[in-house]
Each structure stands twice: as C-alpha cells, then as structure tokens.
C-alpha cells in the first residue's frame, strides 16, 4: 500500500481541504474510526486500484487516526494497512470527545493503562491531574494517544492551555476489580506415545489456595478410573499442580484429557484440554512429496527440505551415491535435522556453489528401532549453455557450410537464424529462421553427445548454405532450462575476396 | 476412493521367494502412500514395508529388511511385495493398505484402504 502524503503524521490548517491518496494492487479503502467515509476509488489501466479521500472544511473534530487497508483482504498475503495521524489545530475544540465508556476504564489487575485525552494540535502542553488535585503526575505523553502508564483507583482530568484560556477534560475514572480469575493450563510429558508407555499430565493453577481439580479422559468412561495426584510448588507462591499418570498405555487411551479446575470462594472455574495419540509401534510419515528427480544450477547454492514426522525421535543421515555425507569441513555442504514441534522434523541438505560432480543419487534416511523412511531422488546439475564454437568453411562442393558447438545441462536446443540485410539487421528486420525442412537453401545435420564425466551434453550442428550471393549474419543460438548463448558469424559468397 | 486386491499368496519352502501383488481401481492411485501389512492369529497388525506416492520413499521393517523389496507401477496401479529367504515367521495374513493423509507412513491407523488380505504359509 503506498498513501501520499506518506506521514505518518500531518499537521493541516482548519477550515483547509485535503487531499488523501492510497494506492495498491487490490481494491483499497479509507477507514475513519471504523467507518468508510466518502471516497472515490478508481482503477488504473496498469492494474493498480486507489482510493481518494477528500477532507473538505477541516475542523479539530477531524483529528485522529485515518487508515487505509485492502476492500477485500480475501487471498492476500498479508492483512496490510497504512495508519495516518492528522492533527487539525483547532482552538475551539479543546480536548477530542471520549465515547461515555472511554472515561470509565476497569483493570482486573495492575497493568499499563492509557487515559485517552487528545487534543488537536501537537504543540500544546498537555498535563494529567488528579480530579482534586492541581499537581501535574509525572506521566508520559502522547499526543496521539493520551497518558500511558500504570494508575491508581482514583479520577483524572487532562488540563491544557490554549492561547490564554485553560482546558479541562471530561473526568476520567480507573476501577481495579478484584478477581482471583482461575488460569489453567495444561501440559504433557508427551502427547504421542507408543503402546506400554506411560502417560503423564499437568494441571496448573496460578493465583489460588483453594482449588479443586476434575479430570476426564478416555478410561473414565469405561469406568477404569487413575488417582490424580496435586501438589504445591513450593518455589513459586499460589502455584497448585495435579497430575495425572497412566502407566502403560493403551491404544484406546487415545483422546481427549480435560483438566477442570473450580474455586468455590466466588465460583470461578476454567478448564483446559489436551489431546493424546497413543499409537501401536513407533513410525515415520512424510508430510510432503520430494520428486524423484530435482535440479540444482551449476554455482549456486540449493537447499533440499525434507519435512517429516516420527516417534520416537529418529536418526537422520544422507547418503549420495550410497555413500554418507557429513559436513564438509570446505563448507561445501551443511546438513541439519531441526525439531520443529514435539514429533515434527525438517532435514536439510545445503549444496554451497554446486559442482558437476554432485549430481547424483542422494538418499536421507530416518529410523529409529521401530520404522524407517528412505527417501530417494535425483539431483541434476543444470548447465547453462554456452556456444563454444562458431565456424564457417568452404568445401569443394560450392556450398558453405557454418558449424556450431556448445555445452549445456539440460540438452541445449539450436536455433539457427540468418540476417541478409546486414545494416538494417537485426534492429529493423527480424533475422530468418533457418534449417526448416521447407527451406530448399539451407541444410541443417545436429549431432548430441552426452558427456558421462562433465554430465553435460554437448550438441554440434552443421549449417549448409547452397549458394550465398551476398554478405550474410549467421547466427547460432543455444537454449535449455537455465540460460541462452548466441554467437553470429558473417558468411561471404565464394567470389567475394574478402572477408568482413 | 480406492480398491485394494491382493494376489500372490501362497504356499512356499522354507528359502523361497514369493511376489505379492496389490491391484487398485481409481484413477487417482498416484495420490496415495501404500503399504504391506501382516496379521497372525491373535495379534496385531503389523507393518511390513511402504512406499511413497511416486516411489521416491521406502521403508521396511526391521523383520523383513534386507530379504524385501516394495515397489509400485503408478502407470498399472499396482503395488508389489517381492519376499525373499522366507522364513517361518514370515507365516501370516498380508494386507495391502492405502493413505491419501500422508505422501509416507508406517502407521497402521494412518490407512485409511485395506485389502482382503493374502495368505503367505512358509513350510519346511
């Protein structure tokens, strides 16, 4: 999103109009406490969508904060929006009006809070005061937001100066309740485990003496009840812990644990749940496909992923051509098996400036004592191709023959083409296309050899011209997957005695 | 959704070898993991081997590792298990079995396909 002016703050005279612009490659909108005021929104012929917002007889009441974001957030990336303050100086509108719920501000514990006086011009000195008091509490500013900081029970007023008149704000009143609220929370040793191990679960409260726990899970159902034990950390003040263990699982302990926790003092409770996998035998599952075959380009770094789940946690190693690979200590290559969640992993294997010589049969294979994976593919280097040679002769037989030799990864594909017009070629004319069966004057013989030690191939084509009667550009373009090489050469008939 | 046929089965001498194969109807076999499982009477199923939706992934289990061989033919929508150097222990109920939730696994609960089952019997 691109707004002009840019801000991310602007300072307009009252009574002025002011033009706002946003622009972005979807359907854009201005937004003004919530609300699309009147815009004019356009689309581009280069595909670009903007939105217009004409401020007209600014007053201080126009201050604030205008944003603009995406019309329709669906399928982006991303859910962008650009903030914009302006202030409208205004000496008749002394301090923003709050909505009646905006003076009246609850805590439930002590935390930063913000008492959102405003006013409308930037330069003013603005004070926070006890309602019943004239001293100036040391809190810090914003002119854009208010006073931030932590408060007392108490009523606050906003007092300002403007030209020779005091200002005060509506009062504003902080409430700290009172809530011993119940937090719970939930956690286990492991949430998958194999059949005969144990399972092992937590319950935590914060903040309370007198709790009581419930658990549920899948044996209560069947009426196979476990004894949960609680305890008090005794490191951490109103910490209470019931935990609960099943030794020796069973495939039907699978599902859900709830922890529910009361506190009968004023009947607060809250619950959390987990879920346990309990599965017959360790295993491995690949969450995505690595194609058989993958490229990487002859210089460059390329990185192959490969993401997985398994239990117990496995040991990764990666072979190329049944051999196995560590890190190089040249740098040449770097491999590593992160954990990225309890049983998920992602292995990587970084080839740094790729030779020829690693292309091959690479292999990552991840085991433990119960299951395995082996996962295969073939990495090819790709060559960008380059035109080695470009030569023209004249045998006996009267016609002239132009060859051409290159190299490349994947097979390079040849294009001949010839420019007769030398001045006005190839700037003003398209140069032919030649060796087309249809073209009686030209023959075309391309022979492809496949290089085992370079794994490349190399392609040569011979051009027969049949009768050149004036100066001609022969041109020889190669072209794979990865790049393209040209080399021209000018052709002269037999009779001319020179060469250009 | 997919079928799942298996064949091969069979008597077989101790030392010998044998091919199980597993026919899938459906048109979209190429989006499905397989794998070869086993049963005898009064366990568990147990895994055998499996293999990745193009091929590119294998696995075996420890019992069967180095004597096996899975591989599929995406073009016949088949899958194969080629035993060899059967040992009695390799007597059991083979199940061939297919997940669309994983390009790989060797979980039994991650299948979601499974087969009639064929009946492999190593004998002295």
């Known amino acids: 999103l691109v707004v002009t002016p840019p801000g991310p703050e602007l300072v307009l005279n009252v009574s002025s109009t002011f033009v706002l612009t946003c622009s972005g490659s979807a359907p854009v909108v201005w937004e003004r406490m919530s609300q699309e005021p009147p815009q004019e929104m356009a689309k581009a012929q280069d595909g670009t969508f903007s939105s217009v917002l004409t401020l007209t007889n600014l007053t201080g009441l126009d201050t604030g904060e205008y944003f603009c974001t995406h019309n329709d957030s669906r399928g982006l990336e991303t859910d962008e929006r650009k903030r914009l303050y302006i202030f409208v100086p205004d000496p008749t509108v002394g301090f923003l009006p709050n909505d009646a719920e905006e003076l009246f501000i609850f805590l439930t514990e002590i935390t930063e809070i913000t008492i959102p006086c405003r006013v409308t011009d930037p330069q003013l000195v603005v004070t926070l005061h006890e309602k019943k008091g004239d001293v100036a509490l040391p809190v810090p500013y914003d002119h854009q937001r208010g006073f931030s900081g932590i408060f007392e029970d108490r009523s606050y007023i906003c007092k300002t100066t403007i030209g020779d008149r005091e200002v005060d704000s509506d009062a504003y009143y902080v409430y700290r309740l009172q809530v011993s609220s119940i937090n719970v929370s939930v956690n286990a040793v492991q949430t998958v485990v194999r059949q005969g191990e144990n399972i092992t679960l937590m319950c935590i409260v914060i903040g309370n003496e007198v709790v009581n726990f419930e658990w549920t899970y899948p044996r209560k159902e069947s009426g196979r009840l476990v004894e949960p034990v609680t305890d008090f950390l005794l490191d951490m003040p109103y910490h209470i812990r019931s935990i609960l263990h099943i030794p020796s699982a069973e495939l039907e302990d699978s599902g859900t644990y709830t922890c529910n926790v009361t506190e009968s003092v004023n009947d607060h409770q809250d619950e959390k749940a987990i879920n346990i996998t309990v599965v017959e035998s360790g295993y491995v599952r690949l969450l995505g496909e690595v194609g058989t075959l993958q490229f990487a380009e002859l210089h460059r770094s390329r990185t192959l992923q490969v993401v997985f789940e398994a239990y117990p946690p496995p040991t990764v190693l990666w072979f190329k051509d049944n051999r196995t690979l560590g890190d190089s200590s040249a740098g040449e290559i770097a491999l590593s098996t992160r954990n990225v969640s309890e049983t998920r992993y992602v292995s990587e294997l970084t080839l740094v400036r790729v030779k020829v010589a690693e292309a091959g049969h690479y292999t990552m294979r991840a085991f433990h004592e119960d299951a395995e994976v082996q996962l295969s593919f073939q990495l090819q280097i790709n060559v960008p191709v380059r035109v080695l040679e470009l030569s023209e002769s004249h045998p006996d037989s009267g016609e002239q023959t132009v060859r051409c030799r290159g190299r490349g990864m994947p097979q390079p594909n040849i294009i001949w083409s010839a420019c007769r017009d030398l001045k006005r070629c190839p700037r003003e004319l398209p140069p032919t296309l030649l060796g087309n069966s249809s073209e009686e004057e030209s023959q075309l013989e391309t022979n492809v050899t496949y290089w085992e030690e370079e794994q490349e191939f190399e392609v040569v084509s011979t051009l027969r011209l049949q009768h050149v009667d004036r100066p001609l550009s022969v041109r020889c373009t190669l072209r794979n997957a990865v790049g393209q090489d040209t080399q021209e050469v000018i052709v002269v008939p037999h009779s001319l005695p020179f060469k250009v | 959704e997919v079928q799942l046929v298996e064949s091969g089965g069979g008597l077989v001498q101790i030392g010998g070898s044998l091919r199980l194969s597993c026919a899938a109807s459906g048109r979209t076999f190429s989006s499905y993991a397989m794998g070869w499982f086993r049963q005898t009477p009064g366990k568990e199923r147990e895994f055998v081997a499996a293999?990745?939706?193009?091929?590119?992934?294998?696995g075996y289990a420890d019992s069967v590792k180095g004597r096996s061989t899975i591989s599929r033919d995406n073009a016949k929508n088949m899958v194969y298990l080629q035993m060899n150097s059967l040992k009695p222990e390799d007597t059991a109920v083979y199940y061939c079995a297919a997940t669309n939730k994983f390009s790989y696994s060797t979980l039994r609960n991650d299948y979601n396909y499974w087969g009639q089952g064929t009946q492999v019997t190593v004998s002295s």
């Open positions: 293999i990745g939706r193009n091929g590119g992934s294998i």
